[in-house]
């Protein structure tokens, strides 16, 4: 099943997020992703846990997953590079870099997103945008078109309360509020964008969605700048 959903959001403006990627397994949407360089898409490591021998591809320039669109391009993956410290049973280091088989043709609907390199927490309350093709309600309806939602960043201390994530949120992770509006498993690997800059990647750990006591968890890309640079080099 696809990992992730946007809850309480709305359909995104078509092609207004040209960095948005759909990571696909055997032709079906699996996870979100974000184009960070001409030949590289950043996603979540857990996304490929169940991929085994399946064919992994990346769809760029898409709004609708099913409809033909002038800007849609499907790229094969040359290699998948999960973070070396990612593990199946934890949400830590949940990052994956996918090298496309060729450089993406950049244009109005396909552009890399600048990512945060300054390792500083985003101010609590900052409104950030998260987008994805994940399930849109608890009944499991999957959208065909890209959805998005604006979420305020939640401070780490609150997120780490016993009633919330009970100390699991390290300095390399960040949280966003989850009161009915939320990202969830199916949006894993997708971007959390604050002020036009990629700040976080949706983690793919299993958690309840849309419950304010269980905020959304995002991997802070700035904390992994050295690793990202070393892989892209």
């Amino acid at each position: 099943p696809p990992r992730g959903r946007i809850l309480g959001g709305r359909e995104a403006e078509a092609h207004a997020r040209p960095y948005m990627a759909s990571v696909q397994l055997n032709g079906a949407h699996l996870c979100g992703g974000v184009l960070v360089a001409e030949q590289w898409v950043l996603s979540a490591a857990h996304c490929l846990e169940d991929a085994a021998d399946g064919k992994v591809q990346v769809l760029l320039g898409a709004h609708s997953l099913s409809q033909p669109e002038p800007s849609k391009r499907l790229y094969d993956v040359l290699r998948a590079v999960p973070h070396p410290d990612s593990q199946p049973d934890t949400i830590d280091h949940d990052l994956l870099l996918l090298q496309l088989s060729e450089k993406a043709t950049l244009g109005p609907a396909v552009r890399p997103l600048p990512w945060q390199r300054v390792d500083r927490d985003v101010a609590p309350g900052t409104l950030c945008d998260v987008a994805g093709w994940g399930i849109v309600n608890h009944a499991g309806r999957r959208p065909d078109s890209l959805q998005h939602v604006l979420l305020p960043v939640l401070d780490r201390a609150t997120c780490n309360r016993r009633t919330h994530h009970d100390g699991a949120i390290t300095e390399r992770l960040m949280c966003a509020e989850s009161n009915r509006r939320d990202s969830c498993k199916g949006d894993s690997g997708g971007p959390l964008v604050c002020g036009g800059v990629l700040e976080g990647v949706v983690t793919s750990g299993s958690r309840v969605c849309g419950n304010r006591k269980k905020p959304g968890i995002y991997t802070r890309v700035a904390s992994y700048a050295a690793w990202i640079d070393s892989v892209l080099a």
Partner: antibody, heavy 118, light 107 residues
């Protein structure tokens, strides 16, 4: 309404450079790419390159690298194409065109006729 | 570079005719094809994008079709204002390339 204004004619000497403007109005300039296209007298259309005014990322036709330089001035919502070391081969009509997410140019300027002559 | 060939450079037509203009790509361009109209005064307009999609404001007498390497533009009932040169253009692979154009001329 969307308008792309280009001067009608430019006359320059061989070896010189020229900077052709394309003044955009009626839309948010930084939200759309701009393409440039060449048409020699009696000939077809030839794609030169395209620029994203929001961050000046450019795709060039390799054939025009070193000949054409694309720039923008967002404050005046104007795109420019500079052509250098001009020869008679550069005499042509040059069009600017707004390039959109449908991967086509939906509005075109009237074109500037460049004449390179001593 | 992908070569786009419009074998018919000029076509003698009559008003009311059904006119079909062909375009062939040197390799499969998977429907990444647009059609433009250039009037005798130099004005250029987008007619069809993505092989068959009519651009807004373009009369429904214009239609596009094709796949793989072979594409066509059809004008179902030629009007006086359709006298122009028509160009196909691929955007499958950089650099984007145009066909040589097909000029419609009244018989």
């Amino acid at each position: 309404q969307v308008q792309l204004q280009q001067p009608g004619t430019e006359l320059v000497k061989p070896g010189a450079s020229v900077k052709l403007p394309c003044k955009a109005s009626g839309y948010t300039f930084t939200s759309y790419w701009m393409q440039w296209v060449k048409q020699r007298p009696g000939q077809g259309l030839e794609w030169i390159g395209e620029i994203d005014p929001s961050d000046t990322y450019i795709n060039y036709n390799q054939k025009f690298k070193g000949k054409a330089t694309l720039t923008v001035d967002t404050s005046s919502t104007t795109a420019y194409m500079q052509l250098s070391s001009l020869t008679s081969e550069d005499s042509a009509v040059y069009y600017c065109a707004r390039y959109t997410t449908i991967m086509a140019s939906d509005y075109w300027g009237q074109g500037t006729t460049l004449t390179v002559s001593s | 570079d992908i070569q786009m060939t419009q074998t018919t450079s000029s076509l003698s037509v009559s008003l009311g005719d059904r006119v079909t203009i062909s375009c062939r790509a040197s390799q499969d361009i998977t429907n990444y094809l647009n059609w433009y109209q250039q009037k005798p005064d130099g004005t250029v307009k987008l007619l069809i994008y993505f092989t068959s999609r009519l651009h807004s404001g373009v009369p429904s007498r214009f239609s596009g079709s094709g796949s793989g390497t072979d594409y066509s533009l059809t004008i179902s009932n030629l009007e006086p204002e359709d006298i122009a040169t028509y160009y196909c253009q691929q955007y499958s692979k950089l650099p984007w390339t145009f066909g040589g154009g097909t000029k419609l001329e009244i018989k």
